[in-house]
């Protein structure tokens, strides 16, 4: 059935589009109250599973620029600076929402899209498969 | 100035709103071709900086459910299972886009919002401040 707006001040929606196409205000509200909430800009170097950041730009996407993590080593860095290959550096991935211009190049029409991004790396104990 | 649509098939936009309010198709396109793209569902247990996942639900937000990581220890887990407090477990955080219903309770009107989420944890060497 067609949803009944719960608030009389809501924008109207045509039945054929509803609820697939919505109006979105791009004036981003930032919920991060702290002035410097992340404090993680140097973790990529200090981690036992360090990573490099790669720039991915797509003007048809919002956000256009995403920095992706790529683990530097297969193993993990020990206290002496050497790599321990008995452990594994693995990417921590997250599915995020982005807006994709649709039709292409349109400044004011988008479609929601889910993409998988690597945010950083962590050091894990490998899964050992024992052969009988 | 008012942007000229780059594609004659673009929806119109009123000057007063443009380019802040846009049309978004909520029919999500998933760019992740793999059936199990994350492959990181057990990293939270196997990591030397393990984390727990906490469910955060907000019906006024899209997506309404977000899982947040909380590091289990201040230190990092050694091979023998004990915690090494000379190292630090730290959250890897990422700013992500969500849609916030605006006005509240409206089914088809949203505002973009940036929120900071903890995706997982990594083990880092601490910054030591030497006192003169």
């Amino acid at each position: 059935g067609i949803a009944i707006p719960r608030n009389s001040g809501c924008p109207n929606s045509e039945d054929k589009n509803f609820p697939r196409t919505v109006m979105v205000n791009l004036n981003i509200h930032n919920r991060n109250t702290s002035t410097n909430p992340k404090r993680s800009s140097d973790y990529y170097n200090r981690s036992t599973s360090p990573w490099n950041l790669h720039r991915n730009e797509d003007p048809e996407r919002y956000p256009s620029v995403i920095w992706e993590a790529k683990c530097r080593h297969l193993g993990c860095v020990k206290a002496d600076g050497n790599v321990d290959y008995h452990m594994n550096s693995v990417p921590i991935q997250q599915e995020i929402l982005v807006l994709r211009r649709e039709p292409r190049h349109c400044p004011n029409s988008f479609r929601l899209e889910k993409i998988l991004v690597s945010v950083g790396c962590t050091c894990v104990t490998p899964i050992v498969h024992h052969v009988a | 100035g008012i942007a000229i649509p780059r594609n004659s098939g673009c929806p119109n936009s009123e000057d007063k709103n443009f380019p802040r309010t846009v049309m978004v198709n909520l029919n999500i396109h998933n760019r992740n071709t793999s059936t199990n793209p994350k492959r990181s569902s057990d990293y939270y247990n196997r990591s030397t900086s393990p984390w727990n996942l906490h469910r955060n639900e907000d019906p006024e937000r899209y997506p309404s459910v977000i899982w947040e990581a909380k590091c289990r220890h201040l230190g990092c887990v050694k091979a023998d299972g004990n915690v090494d407090y000379h190292m630090n477990s730290v959250p890897i955080q990422q700013e992500i886009l969500v849609l916030r219903r605006e006005p509240r309770h409206c089914p088809n009107s949203f505002r973009l919002e940036k929120i900071l989420v903890s995706v997982g944890c990594t083990c880092v060497t601490p910054i030591v401040h030497h006192v003169a």
């Epitope: 990529y44 950041l53 720039r55 730009e57 797509d58 048809e60 956000p63 920095w67 | -």
Partner: antibody, heavy 121, light 107 residues
Framework: EVQLVQSGAEVKKPGSSVKVSCKAS????????IHWVRQAPGQGLEWMGV????????FYNQKFDGRVTLTADESTSTAYMELSSLRSEDTAVYYC??????????????WGQGTTVTVSS | DIQMTQSPSSLSASVGDRVTITCRAS??????IDWFQQKPGKAPKRLIY???DLASGVPSRFSGSGSGTDYTLTISSLQPEDFATYYC?????????FGQGTKLEIK
């Protein structure tokens, strides 16, 4: 008001290094990357690289062969460009410019005033 | 690297003239281009972004068009303050490259 204010002119010897600063104000520093562009006397514009103050990510024009280092200090909203092993052909005006991570359509909308670097023995 | 070739490299025109500057990419894998105006001793100023769109505060006599490898900046009626050097910049392929510039002089 958005402003990018760069450090003053520098005169350097060949083989030395120079570090140019770019102090941002009037916007959220971490929402924008800082790109660096240079212009030799009477020449065109040359893109040098980009730094993301939020993640610490950097990407360089390989033409500079590892001589460029871009950094940022989030606490002071200041970006830095260091160029090492200077040679006479590095004599140029160096510009910083902000670039929105959210919308490429808002790229390079504000520029610093430029810093003249002269390399001479 | 993608080369951006601007033509002409310089041109003379009079106030009121219609002027067109073109920018050609060495390959077609760019996403869009920006146009900048630069006056002597000043930083570049963005005129057109995303190939077509007028930057804030830029007069409507400036317009941009193009796709693929060929792009154009048009000034419909030259004004005295428009005499400057113009640069295109490609976005979408690293490194982001600028054209060599077109110097617009008073005839």
């Amino acid at each position: 008001e958005v402003q990018l204010v760069q450090s003053g002119a520098e005169v350097k010897k060949p083989g030395s290094s120079v570090k140019v600063s770019c102090k941002a104000s009037g916007y959220t520093f971490t929402d924008y990357e800082i790109h660096w562009v240079r212009q030799a006397p009477g020449q065109g514009l040359e893109w040098m690289g980009v730094n993301d103050p939020e993640s610490g990510g950097t990407f360089y024009n390989q033409k500079f062969d590892g001589r460029v280092t871009l950094t940022a200090d989030e606490s002071t909203s200041t970006a830095y460009m260091e160029l090492s092993s200077l040679r006479s052909e590095d004599t140029a005006v160096y510009y910083c410019t902000r670039y929105s991570k959210w919308d490429s359509f808002d790229g390079m909308d504000y520029w610093g005033q430029g810093t003249t670097v002269t390399v001479s023995s | 690297d993608i080369q951006m070739t601007q033509s002409p490299s310089s041109l003379s025109a009079s106030v009121g003239d219609r002027v067109t500057i073109t920018c050609r990419a060495s390959s077609g894998i760019i996403s869009y281009i920006d146009w900048f105006q630069q006056k002597p001793g000043k930083a570049p100023k963005r005129l057109i972004y995303a190939t077509f769109d007028l930057a804030s505060g830029v007069p409507s006599r400036f317009s941009g068009s193009g796709s693929g490898t060929d792009y154009t900046l048009t000034i419909s009626s030259l004004q005295p303050e428009d005499f400057a050097t113009y640069y295109c910049r490609q976005v979408g392929s690293y490194p982001e490259t600028f054209g060599q510039g077109t110097k617009l002089e008073i005839k």
